[in-house]
């Protein structure tokens, strides 16, 4: 499956939007750093089938969308930037969904990759729990924004590696 050229541009735009969402200096939030236990092994493509990688990427973007579309995120972050971010993520999801259909086929279920998808979901659960425990403070959002930028960058790297294998 060939992801459209606009897909990688969308990735870059999403990262830029995440960077622009910064509300306070991160230097004031060093104490709030947290280990969210990013599921790195799910992004190491050594033993990955392409279909599995696409499913994991889709889950990653879906969970990012869910995280940033809550009431609390709307209250803490710039709404204009969030709206643009949703548009970019929505486009990413559409591109990946088309790919999943081509790679996996309708017969195969995403449940084949349940463990990988579950690892991504648990990662986002840890992020949500952290935000809840920190009462959605400005610093908590700053830490989460930095974490999502990092995981998003790793997702982009995986997509690049998949593209280079084609």
């Amino acid at each position: 499956c060939d992801l459209p050229q606009t897909h990688s541009l969308g990735n870059r735009r999403a990262l830029i939007l995440l960077a622009q969402m910064r509300r306070i200096s991160p230097f004031s939030c060093l104490k709030d750093r947290h280990d969210f236990e990013f599921p790195q092994e799910e992004f190491d493509d050594k033993q990955f089938q392409k279909a599995q990688a696409i499913s994991v990427l889709h889950e990653m973007i879906q969970q990012t969308f869910n995280l940033f579309s809550t009431k609390d995120s709307s209250a803490a972050l710039d709404e204009t930037l969030l709206d643009e971010f949703y548009i970019e993520l929505d486009q990413q999801l559409n591109d990946l969904e088309s790919c999943v259909m081509q790679e996996v086929g309708v017969i195969e279920s995403p449940l084949m990759y349940e463990d990988s998808i579950l690892a991504v979901r648990k990662y986002f659960q840890r992020i949500t729990l952290y935000l809840t425990e920190k009462k959605y403070s400005s610093c908590a959002w700053e830490v989460v924004r930095a974490e999502i930028m990092r995981s998003f960058s790793l997702s982009i790297n995986l997509q690049k590696r998949l593209k280079s294998k084609e």
Epitope: A19, S25, L30, K31, R33, D35
Partner: antibody, heavy 121, light 107 residues
């Protein structure tokens, strides 16, 4: 391969200005902060300050606030440390090192080779 | 500011010895403690981060432990290349601070 390459040794006179550099390569320069560390002859390590190259936000150690200026040019993946008026007590080795910012990842995992600054009349 | 106090400031040991260096923070630093090795004329090298995680490429004879305010760097069997100065450093809060260093010399 991740690298931080610093500018060469400098010999200056008291009262002169100086700007030393630290060029990052092999990684996304704006994804990491760059810290500066001083080591005076025969002494230990002292943290001076840090910069987020993505927007040039800075934080300084109280001991160095107002004494030095940290800046960055993300277009050329370079961070700078500068003095407007050097003193003999600024004679030291200066290191830059990268920091993962708010991410839970190893701190100061890569260091520059150091820039020796000698201030003498 | 968080003060970092290392002990001892220097020690003499032989190849094969087990060496322990301690670092105490003036307040809790939530395990955000790093250990560096520095050899004369060289830049510091990260050995241990977050109190106990071994940095990639660092020999397993190096280990870190501790929490709260008290931390330890252990070299299980000292090798000739381990004679150097070791520094602890906290990254819990600004200003970031280093210990004064521990010089490990040949007995």
């Amino acid at each position: 391969e991740v690298q931080l390459v610093q500018s060469g040794a400098e010999v200056k006179k008291p009262g002169e200005s100086l700007k030393i550099s630290c060029k990052g390569s092999g990684y996304s320069f704006t994804s990491y902060w760059i810290g500066w560390v001083r080591q005076m002859p025969g002494k230990g390590l002292e943290w001076m300050g840090i910069i987020d190259p993505s927007d040039s936000d800075t934080a300084y150690s109280p001991s160095f606030q107002g004494q030095v200026t940290i800046s960055a040019d993300k277009s050329i993946s370079t961070a700078y440390l500068q003095w407007s008026s050097l003193k003999a007590s600024d004679t030291a080795m200066y290191y830059c090192a990268r920091h993962p910012g708010l991410n839970w990842a190893p701190d100061f995992d890569y260091w520059g080779q150091g820039t020796l600054v000698t201030v003498s009349s | 500011d968080i003060q970092m106090t290392q002990s001892p400031s220097s020690l003499s040991a032989s190849v094969g010895d087990r060496v322990t260096i301690t670092c105490r923070a003036s307040q809790s630093i939530n395990g955000v403690l790093n250990w560096y090795q520095q050899k004369p004329g060289k830049a510091p090298k990260l050995l241990i981060y977050f109190a106990s995680s071994l940095q990639s490429g660092v020999p397993s004879r190096f280990s870190g432990s501790g929490s709260g305010t008290d931390f330890t760097l252990t070299i299980s069997s000292l090798q000739p290349e381990d004679f150097a100065t070791y520094y602890c450093q906290q990254s819990h809060d600004f200003p970031l601070t280093f210990g004064q260093g521990t010089k490990v010399e040949i007995k």
